[in-house]
């Protein structure tokens, strides 16, 4: 039998301790929120908020401008000054809770924890390829805001998620805020609301539609809004909340809330429980049927998928899929599974399940005892009755009221538990060629870029590297600009190429040339690198013979 070279073990063909230096920016304080802007004339910016300050950066992470957003009551607060001479309420630090782009004219909108959670609109001022912020406009009309009815009170100090949708020329802000009794009593933010920005940017139109946790549940029933996004005809919010109103706080679970993006109303507000599980290939004795539940969503991102993953998920290439990183939760007992799992929920399937749930509630024969749910938002009732009514009313439609769909949507970990002890804290999914890549930040300050594939029993890494020496968790917000992603960790913002930071972590030629084409790796004498790093021969097709 002919002698063969011994095979290099897979793990020995790469080194994840290789240091990669990626561009970074020190913000001078813990990064709170971050958003990117790409104009149509090649101008772009990264907006980074820390306590009392908003930084404007170029795409290279060089500082372009800095704006004081607090403390409220301080003469140096530049945004506060836009509201005219005060006083405007209690003084104090401003933590930026919302940073979104208003696309039409275009402008940046920032909303903070101070000044009743009001927002400021900053017109974008392109100067060459850089972007500056014009003087802020105060989105607050004193005459139509009262403590019990405040259309211009947007941000909650406990957290707020906003998605901006253009309907015609109007900009509608879909707002979801975490509340407690104290916050609810102070200028009455709502749990979920849809607010129209007035054309003259003098604030938000009064008479907006909203849902709020009922006063009697505010103490025990808290909803954390993890993510929001707009795709197709809907806006979606992802929440972590108590599974039961009566047992709250109790065990937590994850829900998806769906709102119409074409009609600014909440009659067709729907919720669906998302169930993510780890189902090992070989089930241990005593392990739960259907897999180990991971009920608590940590981070989420929606993206169109590449051909390979689409085939595995039985959907068409390019279809939008919601990806979520889930953890087991505090009360799950001693875990034998991984710390984090990743589940994929195709949006079309989510919509179908919601629509079927509406049919079950509203089309006869209705299953007796089927509850409308959402008892923390509305009076309890059974389908098909409207909330608070014991019988259907002839002039109200069952469909025109909020509903919790009676079934949940269950998926299993895409990574088959292979994330192991890794604690994922940030997620952004991209499609590169026909491949779908999950870009993940971790609790110990690393970036993992991994191909998403269901059928493998190992992880297909694009990269796995440390952002620096601080080891601080990577934060939830991730933004994209061109071919780069921007991650925040501690007081730093990092620019990470979508195709990975480099190829040096591949140690063997064979492993190097098997890297995905989009990475641009080739063998370069005795190392794996990109063509521009290789002064001599660079080979993407053949390895030199092993001696």
């Amino acid at each position: 039998k002919e002698w063969q070279c011994p095979r290099t073990p897979y793990a020995a063909s790469r080194d994840f301790n290789v240091k990669y230096m990626v561009p970074s920016f020190s913000a001078g304080g813990l990064v709170q929120t971050m958003v990117t802007y790409q104009g149509d004339k090649n101008e772009s910016a990264v907006f980074v908020a820390i306590r009392n300050r908003l930084h404007v950066l170029g795409p290279d992470l060089k500082s372009v401008q800095s704006l004081a957003t607090g403390p409220a009551g301080d003469p140096g607060c530049q945004t506060c000054a836009a509201c005219g001479p005060g006083p405007h309420g209690p003084s104090g630090d401003t933590d930026t809770k919302v940073l979104v782009l208003e696309p039409a004219l275009p402008a940046l909108v920032s909303c903070g924890s101070s000044l009743q959670g009001r927002c400021f609109l900053h017109d974008l001022d392109p100067q060459g390829t850089a972007v500056h912020l014009a003087a802020p406009a105060c989105l607050f009309s004193a005459h139509h805001n009262r403590p019990d009815d405040c259309p211009d009170c947007v941000a909650s100090p406990l957290g707020t998620r906003v998605t901006v949708v253009e309907q015609g020329q109007a900009s509608y802000f879909y707002v979801a805020s975490s509340l407690d009794a104290a916050v609810a009593a102070s200028f009455s933010p709502r749990s979920v609301s849809i607010r129209r920005l007035k054309a003259d940017a003098s604030g938000f139109a009064p008479g907006f539609v909203a849902l709020s946790v009922l006063p009697k549940h505010l103490v025990s029933y808290s909803i954390e809004y993890v993510h929001s996004f707009h795709t197709g005809a809907f806006v979606y919010f992802l929440t972590v909340q108590p599974a039961s109103v009566t047992d709250a706080p109790g065990a937590l679970h994850t829900r998806l809330a769906r709102l119409s993006a074409t009609e600014p109303e909440l009659g067709d507000y729907r919720e669906l429980v998302l169930d993510c599980r780890f189902a090992p290939k070989r089930r241990r004795r005593g392990a739960p049927e259907g897999g180990q539940p991971y009920p608590v969503l940590r981070v989420a991102h929606s993206a169109p998928v590449g051909a390979q993953l689409a085939t595995e998920l039985s959907i068409a290439e390019g279809q939008e899929v919601l990806f979520g990183v889930f953890v087991a939760g505090k009360d799950s007992g001693p875990g034998v599974g991984p710390n984090s799992v990743v589940c994929a929920f195709p949006i079309d399937l989510l919509d179908t399940l919601i629509d079927e749930g509406v049919e079950r509630c509203c089309e006869s024969p209705v299953h007796p005892g089927l509850r409308r749910g959402l008892d923390f938002f509305q009076s309890p009732s059974f389908c098909p009755n409207p909330p608070g009514l014991e019988a259907p009313s002839p002039n109200t439609s069952c469909r025109h009221f909020p509903l919790l769909v009676s079934s949940s949507f269950s998926r299993v970990d895409l990574f088959n538990g292979l994330l192991g002890t890794v604690e994922v804290t940030a997620l952004y999914v991209t499609r590169l060629d026909n491949v779908t890549v999950a870009h993940m930040g971790t609790a110990d300050g690393r970036i993992l870029q991994v191909e998403l594939a269901r059928s493998l029993n190992y992880l297909l890494y694009v990269s796995n590297f440390s952002l620096g020496d601080s080891g601080q968790p990577v934060q939830r917000d991730v933004s994209r600009l061109g071919d780069h992603l921007f991650f925040a960790s501690g007081d730093q913002v990092f620019q990470v190429p979508i195709q990975g930071p480099g190829c040096r972590h591949f140690l063997t030629c064979g492993r190097c040339l098997r890297a995905q084409r989009f990475m641009g790796c080739g063998w370069c004498g005795n190392m794996c690198g990109r063509q521009k790093e290789c002064p001599g021969s660079w080979q993407q097709d053949h390895c030199p013979p092993k001696l």
Partner: antibody, heavy 120, light 107 residues
Framework: EVQLQQSGPELVKPGASMKISCRAA????????MNWVKQSHGKSLEWIGL????????SHNQKFKGKATLTVDKSSSTAYMELLSLTSEDSAVYYC?????????????WGQGISVTVSS | DILLTQSPAILSVSPGERVSFSCRAS??????IHWYQQRTNGSPRLLIK???ESISGIPSRFSGSGSGTDFTLSINSVESEDIADYYC?????????FGAGTKLELK
């Protein structure tokens, strides 16, 4: 002194297109948006759309989408409106008017207007 | 679109009289209403912004009031130079809209 100087009157043939200008002086041009307003003979005012003089962002009245294209040249502090495929319905006086898009401001300065006549 | 209805279409006054123009919005627009004067062959001129805020250089005889859907422009002692068309305009919602106008003429 704030001034909005519009180009002179125009006689154009049906089917043609034309570009009218509004040159600004006496204020920080890029801090504002420029509105365009139509007034047909003996009629009221109709808002066509506006352009952010800073970043070129626009908002149109749907009625004029495809009829009016708004542009800006920051170097000459001039806003432009191109009117496309003109018909007799487009015969009117067209005004530019500056506006700071934020609470507390309205269209405080107007150009002198340009009379457009569409006739063969 | 928000419809602004101005009434009356024509107002006939004598110099020195007090006169009021009405503007009604088809929905609540807070105080996002502005008033303009347009003399014959002239450009519109801003008189009042945000329902009641005065404009520098505009005579103090012009005043405005109202909020929600009903708004009023008043001239407390009409002078001959006030003969013109008067328009209200809303900035609450896109598209921005104007009323049909009220013509002020001398008796």
């Amino acid at each position: 002194e704030v001034q909005l100087q519009q180009s002179g009157p125009e006689l154009v043939k049906p089917g043609a297109s034309m570009k009218i200008s509004c040159r600004a002086a006496g204020f920080s041009f890029t801090g504002y948006t420029m509105n365009w307003v139509k007034q047909s003979h003996g009629k009221s005012l109709e808002w066509i759309g506006l352009i952010n003089l800073n970043n070129g962002g626009t908002s149109h009245n749907q009625k004029f989408k495809g009829k009016a294209t708004l542009t800006v040249d920051k170097s000459s502090s001039t806003a432009y409106m191109e009117l496309l495929s003109l018909t007799s319905e487009d015969s009117a006086v067209y005004y530019c008017a500056r506006w700071l898009r934020r609470g507390g401001y309205a269209m405080d300065y107007w150009g002198q207007g340009i009379s457009v006549t569409v006739s063969s | 679109d928000i419809l602004l209805t101005q009434s009356p279409a024509i107002l006939s006054v004598s110099p020195g009289e007090r006169v009021s123009f009405s503007c009604r919005a088809s929905q609540n627009i807070g105080t996002s209403i502005h008033w303009y004067q347009q003399r014959t062959n002239g450009s519109p001129r801003l008189l009042i912004k945000y329902a009641s805020e005065s404009i520098s250089g505009i005579p103090s005889r012009f005043s405005g009031s109202g909020s929600g859907t009903d708004f009023t422009l008043s001239i407390n002692s009409v002078e001959s130079e006030d003969i013109a068309d008067y328009y209200c305009q809303q900035s609450d919602s896109w598209p921005l809209t104007f009323g049909a106008g009220t013509k002020l003429e001398l008796k």
